[in-house]
Structure formats: structure tokens, C-alpha cells
């Protein structure tokens, strides 16, 4: 009686279980009662990453330098090329088809997490006691200067964008 289901790494065709092609190979011809499945390696610029019955391999992704892309991992007959972005850029999507510049954190905000090839800069507002007076993709919020440790007093209060201004103590009040 012909099978209705096949083992792992097999497929059912013409009431017969045929072996799937291994990763890196494509199907040329199905097995018969007398012959095995015929498979052929994918070409140099193609891949198949699963046991399969595909008659065509997939083209490797191209990490186009004109789009700011670079190769993170070369494609093989069994795996696709993995792209990432050049320094200063990050991917616009999970599949990393193109890149955009990292955003900078504006004055009053500091870098919580530096951008990578696949994720943008994460900014956070500078809390009380901290400030950032620059637009930067790298700088964290910095603490206000401690006037006391310098034997000075606060002459102008700090904000989230400016440091405190220290000055000499008013000796006449002492």
C-alpha cells in the first residue's frame, strides 16, 4: 500500500517517499521506484538553508556599499549573506536593506544606549543634577559641577542643558 506520510527529510510524490535535498543543494529530479532523488549544489552566489525540494536556489543578498551596507557574514551555499551598516549608520529594518545615520541626542538629553550597526541611538532626558549642552550620538548626561568640593558656591543654578556656575564665597556674610 502506498504511503500517506513520509519520514523526516523525505517528501511524498507519486505515492512514493523521496529524500529531500540537503541544505546547499537543489532538486534536479524526483526519485522513482528505481532511482534516488537527484540533487545539485547551488551555484557560488546562491543558497538553500533547509532540507528541500526546491528546483531553484535563492540568490545571496547583496550588501550594497552605495546604500551604506557592508558584509557581516559572507553567504555560503547553505546560508544567506548577512549585511550590517557602516560606522555611523544603522539598519532601517530587521532585514537590513538600507542604512540611515545614527541620530544625535539634543542638548538636555544624553545617550542612554550607543547605536550599533542594527539599532539607533537611544536618548534619555537629563535628570535633575545632570546636563548635556551638546548634540551628540555618544555623550551621556554629565553631572553638575560640585561647587562645594572646590570651596566655591553656586552663583547660577544648573539646568538640563547647562552646568552650574560656581563663584567665590561672599566673605562679608561670614
Amino acid at each position: 500500500e502506498p504511503p500517506t506520510a513520509c519520514r523526516e527529510k523525505q517528501y511524498l510524490i507519486n505515492s512514493q517517499c523521496c529524500s529531500l535535498c540537503q541544505p546547499g543543494q537543489k532538486l534536479v529530479s524526483d526519485c522513482t521506484e528505481f532511482t534516488e532523488t537527484e540533487c545539485l549544489p547551488c551555484s557560488e552566489s546562491e543558497f538553500l538553508d533547509t532540507w528541500n525540494r526546491e528546483t531553484r536556489c535563492h540568490q545571496h543578498k547583496y550588501c550594497d556599499p552605495n546604500l551604506g551596507l557592508q558584509v557581516q557574514q559572507k553567504g555560503t551555499s547553505e546560508t544567506d549573506t548577512i549585511c550590517t551598516c557602516e560606522e555611523g549608520l544603522h539598519c532601517t529594518s530587521e532585514s537590513c536593506e538600507s542604512c540611515v545615520p545614527h541620530r544625535s541626542c539634543l542638548p538636555g538629553f544624553g545617550v542612554k544606549q550607543i547605536a550599533t550597526g542594527v539599532s539607533d541611538t537611544i536618548c534619555e532626558p537629563c535628570p535633575v543634577g545632570f546636563f548635556s549642552n551638546v548634540s551628540s550620538a555618544f555623550e551621556k548626561c554629565r553631572p553638575w559641577t560640585s561647587c562645594e568640593t572646590k570651596d566655591l558656591v553656586v552663583q547660577q543654578a544648573g539646568t538640563n542643558k547647562t552646568d552650574v556656575v560656581c563663584g567665590p564665597q561672599d566673605r562679608q556674610r561670614a
Epitope: 541544505p23 551555484s43 557560488e44 552566489s45 547583496y62 557592508q70 559572507k74 555560503t76 547553505e78 546560508t79
Partner: antibody, heavy 116, light 113 residues
């Protein structure tokens, strides 16, 4: 017999141009990725460019990007490297190498000397 | 760029001796998709182009004598010649075949005592 033979090397002045070729025989040229690799006493072995089979995807080393162009003519079983704005540090033996995931066949090389 | 560091830079040996040379990469050459290490070894004799010996870190190219063995994974790799012959005197290079730019080590020169 699988063979790669480079030609077109020579002496060129700084800022000049040169086109080197690689003639392939004994295998289906269009099925393989092709590369240029150079070798000098100063820098050792240095991969400089790759062109894939199929769609002809291209990658370059930063040291030659914008100055060198890799191309292929599958009908003539030939690989090319057009070199412009040549510098003294481009002086080297230039090899073409076939690849299907790794460099399995290399040519005998052609010497490029950049000097005034 | 991946930096390939080979050691020692030269080795003086006697015929029949067992030789090991090291190659370290600045980042892993292991492809997580197929669990292969994309590290290649070449042999170069004076006046000749490099010749493929080992690919995928441990797979011997056809026609290469079985006295040549590649091993290692991730960032640390070794080429072993079980019993050096006079014809093995050459420079041995390892190469990152994992990502572009493809990079080579500076080589290990094998010399006869």
C-alpha cells in the same frame, strides 16, 4: 586542466592607470566567483576585489575602493581589473583567484610596479 | 576588519618532525547558520602562487597529503604537519573567509635545519 593566466602588468607612473586581465580555461568560468589578490613584501597577501557569478555582485577592499574596478566577460572567460590613480603602495604581484566559497585555484600572477 | 595573527613567524625543523603552527582571528569565524568555521590554510613556495591546503578549518583539499591537518574553532586555529617532508618547506598562510574584507595572516615560514 584548470588554469588562470594573468597578463597586462608592467611599470606605470604614480597617478597612472593600468588594466590587467585573467584568462580562465578548463572550467565553466561563469559558475565561479572571481577575485583579485595582491602580494608585496611590505603588505603580504592582500585581497582587493571580488565579483560573484550570477548577478555579478562586487566587493572591494577599502584601500582600492573608488580607484580600481573589477569586471568579467563570461563569453570570453576573462576577468579584468582596471586600476586608476595608482600609488607606489600598489606595487605588487597581482593574482586572480577562483572561488566557490574559498580560493581553490590561483593564477601565476602579473607584476605591477608603480614608480616615477 | 578581522585581523589574522600567525605564530611563530618562522620554524626551523628536521625532516620527519611533527610541526604545529597557530592562527588566531580577532573575531569568530564560525558561521552559526551551518556551524562551519570559515578559515582557510594556504601553502606558498618561492616563485609560486599560494596553493589551497585546508578549507572550513579542517577539510583537506583533494590531492593534499593526509600529513596536513587543520583544527580549531571560533578564533583559534592550528595547522599540523605530522611528519615534515623536504617538499613542505614553504610559507603557510591562514585566511579569514568569513567576511569581507577577506584577510590573511602574515605567514609562518617553514625552514629546514
Amino acid at each position: 586542466e584548470v588554469q588562470l593566466v594573468e597578463s597586462g602588468g608592467g611599470l606605470v607612473k604614480p597617478g597612472g592607470s593600468l588594466k590587467v586581465s585573467c584568462a580562465a580555461s578548463g572550467f565553466t568560468f561563469s559558475d565561479y566567483g572571481m577575485n583579485w589578490v595582491r602580494q608585496s613584501p611590505e603588505k603580504g597577501l592582500e585581497w582587493i576585489a571580488y565579483i560573484s557569478s550570477g548577478r555579478g555582485n562586487i566587493y572591494y577592499a577599502d584601500t582600492v575602493k573608488g580607484r580600481f574596478t573589477i569586471s568579467r566577460d563570461n563569453a570570453k572567460n576573462t576577468l579584468f581589473l582596471q586600476m586608476t590613480s595608482l600609488r607606489s603602495e600598489d606595487t605588487a604581484m597581482y593574482y586572480c583567484a577562483r572561488s566557490w566559497g574559498y580560493f581553490d585555484v590561483w593564477g601565476t600572477g602579473t607584476t605591477v610596479t608603480v614608480s616615477s | 576588519d578581522i585581523v589574522m595573527t600567525q605564530s611563530p613567524s618562522s620554524l626551523t625543523v628536521t625532516a620527519g618532525e611533527k610541526v604545529t603552527m597557530s592562527c588566531k582571528s580577532s573575531q569568530s569565524l564560525l558561521n552559526s547558520g551551518n556551524q562551519k568555521n570559515y578559515l582557510t590554510w594556504f601553502q606558498q613556495k618561492p616563485g609560486q602562487p599560494p596553493k589551497l591546503l585546508i578549507y572550513w578549518a579542517s577539510t583537506r583539499e583533494s590531492g593534499v597529503p593526509d600529513r596536513f591537518t587543520g583544527s580549531g574553532s571560533g578564533t583559534d586555529f592550528t595547522l599540523t604537519i605530522s611528519s615534515v617532508q623536504a617538499e613542505d618547506l614553504a610559507v603557510y598562510y591562514c585566511q579569514n573567509d568569513y567576511t569581507y574584507p577577506l584577510t590573511f595572516g602574515a605567514g609562518t615560514k617553514l625552514e629546514l635545519k
